[in-house]
Interface confidence: low
Amino acid sequence: CNLSQTHSLNNRRTLMLMAQMRRISPFSCLKDRHDFEFPQEEFDGNQFQKAQAISVLHEMMQQTFNLFSTKNSSAAWDETLLEKFYIELFQQMNDLEACVIQEVGVEETPLMNEDSILAVKKYFQRITLYLMEKKYSPCAWEVVRAEIMRSLSFSTNLQKRLRRKD
């Protein structure tokens, strides 16, 4: 499976859109900072079979999509930027799905690392709970936006390593 240059471009565009979505200075939100315990070990990528890594990346994209496609999210961000963000994420998910099928065949399901998938789910659950506790305040969303940028950077790095393996 070849995660193409187009996919790489999608990644960069996703990160760029996330950066553009910033509405307030992160420095005005220092008191709201929070450690969401990003499951970095799941993105180190050395212990993975390729199909497993792709599955974890797909889960990351799916959960990011879910997070930013809620009513609370559309109230918090610029709609045009959000729409573009959805398109980029959706495209990435499609690419990754095609990759899983190519890697393991349509009929087979890879022996994916369930632990990793659940770790990503749990990470996003922590983010959702934080937003709820902070009543979806502008600062809470800014903290989350910065966090998602960070996690998408890890995803991008893992994808680069996967491309190098091709």
Partner: antibody, heavy 119, light 108 residues
Amino acid sequence: QVQLQQPGAELVKPGASVKLSCKASGYTFTNYWMHWVKQRPGQGLEWIGEINPSHGRTIYNENFKSKATLTVDKSSITAFMQLSSLTSEDSAVYFCARGGLGPAWFAYWGQGTLVTVSA
Amino acid sequence: QIVLTQSPAIMSASPGEKVTLTCSAGSSVDSSYLYWYQQKPGSSPKLWIYSTSNLASGVPARFSGSGSGTSYSLTISSMEAEDAASYFCHQWSSYPFTFGSGTKLEIK
């Protein structure tokens, strides 16, 4: 083949505790999360929580946090669930089910243990 | 938590009849994580359909699953006596994982 063995029944008194077991065989015990599910007579299924046998990490349904405690014993490849301060509401069949992904998710279940809480 | 509502609670169908069971989610569920289980009295549940539309091993081809977002369904194209059972939908899209209350399918 994959098997999850559970005792058939447990009769316990109100206020007491009970420790249910689920013995795994036919696969690498530490590679899959073990889940527990409750079913009251003639009713639906409720997810209680899960435990990763590899390092003992647990995730609970908030509704069961003060009721259930999940543990494993790697040497006997057995998962356990302790239920405390039992009441008639806890009378139910308790299943263990093995995690996995895709077609492996909850593809294997124990036969269930019927817990009856009665004086 | 995501509440799954199944309807009808009980239904009976004649042999050869087409049957559709529905599962409605209180909030959106990723279709990859929407599953169906079949349970017969005195037995543990059996995985029946995974990821919305994929039949588990050994499930007859007369069964199918479909749906997305908050609306899912299980269809039997032609009811047979052995299909009489309870069917539960289940999501593990987000914590806590939840099950529907079930549909008891009887044969007329």
